[in-house]
C-alpha cells in the first residue's frame, strides 16, 4: 500500500482466483482514543471500532472511502484504490492500446518543434467516473523539470457501437535547450483512476523522436508562360523552430490526379519551391520533415491545380 | 583546408559531408521503430559517448560568438564514433556485409573530422572505451544504440554546418 495523495491510498493486489489479498491497517487521524467507529462509503454499517481498523483487501468491494467517526461526526477519511497485477503485469483496462508505433502503446506524444513543448494523448471508451493526472520530467534518476497543464477531453469519436474519448495534455520542459543533443529521455507518467481502480501508464522518449512539423503554409501556384508547368512555392510552418538556416526542413512534393489510383510521382527537395506539371483536376501536395533527423513527416498541405 | 588555429572551416564542404553522414546513419539503422532496445536491459550502454550539450556553443548565438568551441566538440565526437565504428563492436559477429552503409559511414566520419583538423594542431580527444561484448547479441544491441546516438549527434552537427554555411561563410 502506498499514498497517492493526502488521504488516498493505492493497494497493490495480485489478481487471481482465491488470492489472499493484502492486509491493510487504517489509522484514524485524530487525537481521540475512545468511541471511534468505522464505516465504508455511504453504508451506515459499522465495520469496527477503535483508533485503527484492520481489513483484508481482496476485491473492489473492499475498496472505497473508509471514514472514522465519533459521536456521529466524521473525524477523517481514507480512500482505498486497487491496482491489479495479473500474471505479474499491471492491469491496463482503462486506456486503449493505440498499437502505433508498436503494441502496448497507450500514450502517444508529438512535438511541433524543438522548443521543449509537446502534447500527449490517449484513448478510452470510459465516459464517467474517470480522472487523470500527469507528471513529467527529463530523466528519472536526477530528474529535470517539465511542467504539464490540465488534462482535457480533446475529441469524441464513434467507433462502431462504442464511443471513444481522446484526452490530451500539453507539457513544456522548464529549461529547454533546442540546439543541444538530448542525452536523457523525457518521462511522462499518467495516473488513471476509474471508480476505485487505479492504473498508471508511462512513456519515455526524446523530443527529437516525436517531432512532427505542422504542414507547410502558403502554398502558391504560378503558371509559367507558354508551358504546361507551374511554379509552386510554400513556406515553413509558423510553429517550426527558428532560425530556419539552423533548424532546416526537407520537403516531399507530389501531384495527385483526380483518380486515387493514378501514379503519384514524389519528389524530395530542400528548397521551398519547385516546378511541376500540374494538370487540370489534379492537386499539388507538400509535406515537411526535419532535414537531418528522420522523425515523422507532417500532414500534407494541398492546393488544387486549376 | 580547415580551421588553422582559429579561422573558419570550409563550411560548405562540411555542410555537404555532414548531410551525407545523416543519410548514411539512417540507412545503417532504419529499423528503429520495430525494435525494443530497452527490453534488453535498461542500463544506458551509450552513456559514455560524447554529446553536444547546451554549453558547447553549438546554438546559433554560440556559433556567432565563437564557433571554435562547438567545432572542437563536434570533432571530438566524430573521432570517437569513427573509432567505435572501426572497433570489434562493428567488425565482430554478426558481421556486416562489405556493402553495408556502416563502411561508408566510418569513412565519412573520418573525412569530416579531417576537414576540421587544424594544420599542425591536434585537439585532444576523449579516450575511446572499447567494450567488447562477450555475446554477439550484445554486440548487435550496442551497434543499434551507438547508431541511434550517432543519428542524434550528426543531426546537430549538420545543423551547425548548414547554419555556418548560410550565415558565417566568408
Amino acid at each position: 500500500i502506498w499514498e497517492l495523495k493526502k488521504d488516498v491510498y493505492v493497494v497493490e493486489l495480485d489478481w487471481y482466483p482465491d488470492a489472499p489479498g493484502e492486509m491493510v491497517v487504517l489509522t484514524c487521524d485524530t487525537p481521540e482514543e475512545d468511541g471511534i467507529t468505522w464505516t465504508l462509503d455511504q453504508s451506515g454499517e459499522v465495520l469496527g471500532s477503535g483508533k485503527t481498523l484492520t481489513i483484508q483487501v481482496k476485491e473492489f468491494g473492499d475498496a472505497g472511502q473508509y471514514t472514522c467517526h465519533k459521536g456521529g461526526e466524521a473525524l477523517s477519511h481514507s480512500l482505498l484504490l486497487l491496482h491489479k497485477k495479473e500474471d505479474g503485469i499491471w492491469s491496463t483496462d482503462v486506456l486503449k492500446d493505440q498499437k502505433e508505433p508498436k503494441n502496448k502503446t497507450f500514450l502517444r506524444c508529438e512535438a511541433k518543434n524543438y522548443s521543449g513543448r509537446f502534447t500527449c494523448w490517449w484513448l478510452t471508451t470510459i465516459s464517467t467516473d474517470l480522472t487523470f493526472s500527469v507528471k513529467s520530467s527529463r530523466g528519472s534518476s536526477n530528474p529535470q523539470g517539465v511542467t504539464c497543464g490540465a488534462v482535457t477531453l480533446s475529441a469524441e469519436r464513434v467507433r462502431g457501437d462504442n464511443k471513444e474519448y481522446e484526452y490530451s495534455v500539453e507539457c513544456q520542459e522548464d529549461s529547454a535547450c533546442p540546439a543541444a543533443e538530448e542525452r536523457l529521455p523525457i518521462e511522462v507518467m499518467v495516473d488513471a483512476i476509474h471508480k476505485l481502480k487505479y492504473e498508471n501508464y508511462t512513456s519515455s522518449f526524446f523530443i527529437r523522436d516525436i517531432i512532427k512539423p505542422d504542414p507547410p503554409k502558403n502554398l502558391q501556384l504560378k503558371p509559367l508562360k507558354n508551358s504546361r508547368q507551374v511554379e509552386v512555392s510554400w513556406e515553413y510552418p509558423d510553429t517550426w523552430s527558428t532560425p530556419h538556416s539552423y533548424f532546416s526542413l526537407t520537403f516531399c512534393i507530389q501531384v495527385q490526379g483526380k483518380s486515387k489510383r493514378e501514379k503519384k510521382d514524389r519528389i524530395f527537395t530542400d528548397k521551398t519551391s519547385a516546378t511541376v506539371i500540374c494538370r487540370k483536376n489534379a492537386s499539388f501536395s507538400v509535406q515537411a520533415q526535419d532535414r537531418y533527423y528522420s522523425s515523422s513527416w507532417s500532414e500534407w498541405a494541398s492546393v488544387p491545380c486549376s | 583546408r580547415a580551421v588553422p588555429g582559429g579561422s573558419s572551416p570550409a563550411w560548405a564542404q562540411c555542410q555537404q559531408l555532414s548531410q551525407k553522414l545523416c543519410t548514411l546513419a539512417w540507412s545503417a539503422h532504419p529499423l528503429v521503430g520495430h525494435m525494443d532496445l530497452r527490453e534488453e536491459g535498461d542500463e544506458e550502454t551509450t552513456n559514455d559517448v560524447p554529446h553536444i550539450q547546451c554549453g558547447d556553443g553549438c546554438d546559433p548565438q554560440g556559433l556567432r560568438d565563437n564557433s571554435q568551441f562547438c567545432l572542437q566538440r563536434i570533432r571530438q565526437g566524430l573521432i570517437f564514433y569513427e573509432k567505435l565504428l572501426g572497433s570489434d563492436i562493428f567488425t565482430g559477429e554478426p558481421s556486416l556485409l562489405p556493402d553495408s552503409p556502416v563502411g561508408q559511414l566510418h569513412a565519412s566520419l573520418l573525412g569530416l573530422s579531417q576537414l576540421l583538423q587544424p594544420e599542425g594542431h591536434h585537439w585532444e580527444t576523449q579516450q575511446i572505451p572499447s567494450p567488447s561484448p562477450s555475446q554477439p547479441w550484445q554486440r548487435l544491441l550496442l551497434r543499434f544504440k551507438i547508431l541511434r546516438s550517432l543519428q542524434a549527434f550528426v543531426a546537430v552537427a549538420a545543423r551547425v554546418f548548414a547554419h555556418g554555411a548560410a550565415t558565417l561563410s566568408p
Epitope: - | 540507412s27 532504419p30 529499423l31 520495430h34 525494435m35 525494443d36 532496445l37 527490453e39 534488453e40 570489434d88 567488425t91 565482430g92 559477429e93 554478426p94 558481421s95 556486416l96 556485409l97 553495408s100 562477450s134 555475446q135 554477439p136 547479441w137 548487435l140 544491441l141 551497434r143 543499434f144
Partner: antibody, heavy 126, light 111 residues
Framework: QVQLVQSGAEVKKPGSSVKVSCKAS????????ITWVRQAPGQGLEWMGE????????YYNEKFKGRVTITADKSTSTAYMELSSLRSEDTAVYYC???????????????????WGQGTLVTVSS | DIVMTQSPDSLAVSLGERATINCKAS???????????LHWYQQKPGQPPKLIYN??KLESGVPDRFSGSGSGTDFTLTISSLQAEDVAVYYC?????????FGGGTKVEIK
C-alpha cells in the same frame, strides 16, 4: 560447389589429444565462420565453439574448460579443432559446419550452419 | 547456459497428417522483442544435420509444409502434411547466448 572435407577417423587413448581438420573449398573462406558440433553415439548435438577467420574471434563452450582449441589457417582455408585430456565420454562424431552469421537491415541477426563436413569419428579407448 | 527442452522425445504420425514439435528455452531467446535467435535442424540417419528453419524463415529448398512459430521461450516446428522423406530427428538450436545450445531432439516416425 561448397565443400567441407574433414580428416579421417581417429582412435585415441584417454589423456591424449586429437586434432581434427576441416578443409573448406568453393567459397571465400574468410567470409564465413566455422562451427564445431559433436554427437556422441545415439545422442543429440552439442555445440563446441566457432571461429571467424575475418574478425579473428573465437567462441567456446565453457563446458570444455579450456580443453578445446579452435583455429583456422587462412592460407590453406582449413579449420582445426583440437581436444585435449581426452576421456571415454569424448567418443563422438565431430562435425565442422560453415556458419554464416551476418547482420543486414532485413535480417539483423541471421545465423545459419548451412554446409557440414562428413563428420570425423573419434574413439577414446584404453 | 540456456537449456533447450524439446517435446515429445519421439512422435509417430500417419502419412499426410500434421506433426508438431515443441521447443522450450529456459530463458528468452528473442532479441529486441522481435528477433528470435532460434533455428530448426533436421538430421537423417548417417547424415550431418541440415538447416530447415531459420529465424522464422524457411530456408530455400525446404518444402513449405514446414513452418515455425513462437517467440520468447516457446517455439514450435510444424510439418503440415508428413511425407516419408520427413522421417528424421529434429533439433532446435538457440544462438542468443554463448554457449549455443541444441534441444535434445525429437524423432519423427511414420505410424
Amino acid at each position: 560447389q561448397v565443400q567441407l572435407v574433414q580428416s579421417g577417423a581417429e582412435v585415441k587413448k584417454p589423456g591424449s589429444s586429437v586434432k581434427v581438420s576441416c578443409k573448406a573449398s568453393g567459397y571465400t573462406f574468410t567470409s564465413y565462420g566455422i562451427t564445431w558440433v559433436r554427437q556422441a553415439p545415439g545422442q543429440g548435438l552439442e555445440w563446441m565453439g566457432e571461429n571467424y577467420p575475418r574478425s579473428g574471434n573465437t567462441y567456446y563452450n565453457e563446458k570444455f574448460k579450456g580443453r578445446v582449441t579452435i583455429t583456422a589457417d587462412k592460407s590453406t582455408s582449413t579449420a582445426y579443432m583440437e581436444l585435449s585430456s581426452l576421456r571415454s565420454e569424448d567418443t563422438a562424431v565431430y562435425y565442422c559446419a560453415r556458419v554464416e552469421f551476418i547482420s543486414t537491415v532485413v535480417a539483423p541477426y541471421y545465423y545459419a550452419l548451412d554446409y557440414w563436413g562428413q563428420g570425423t569419428l573419434v574413439t577414446v579407448s584404453s | 547456459d540456456i537449456v533447450m527442452t524439446q517435446s515429445p522425445d519421439s512422435l509417430a504420425v500417419s502419412l499426410g497428417e500434421r506433426a508438431t514439435i515443441n521447443c522450450k528455452a529456459s530463458k528468452k531467446v528473442t532479441i529486441f522483442g522481435s528477433i528470435s535467435a532460434l533455428h530448426w535442424y533436421q538430421q537423417k540417419p548417417g547424415q550431418p544435420p541440415k538447416l530447415i528453419y531459420n529465424l522464422a524463415k524457411l530456408e530455400s529448398g525446404v518444402p513449405d509444409r514446414f513452418s515455425g512459430s513462437g517467440s520468447g521461450t516457446d517455439f514450435t516446428l510444424t510439418i503440415s502434411s508428413l511425407q516419408a522423406e520427413d522421417v528424421a530427428v529434429y533439433y532446435c538450436l538457440q544462438n542468443k547466448e554463448v554457449p549455443y545450445t541444441f534441444g535434445g531432439g525429437t524423432k519423427v516416425e511414420i505410424k
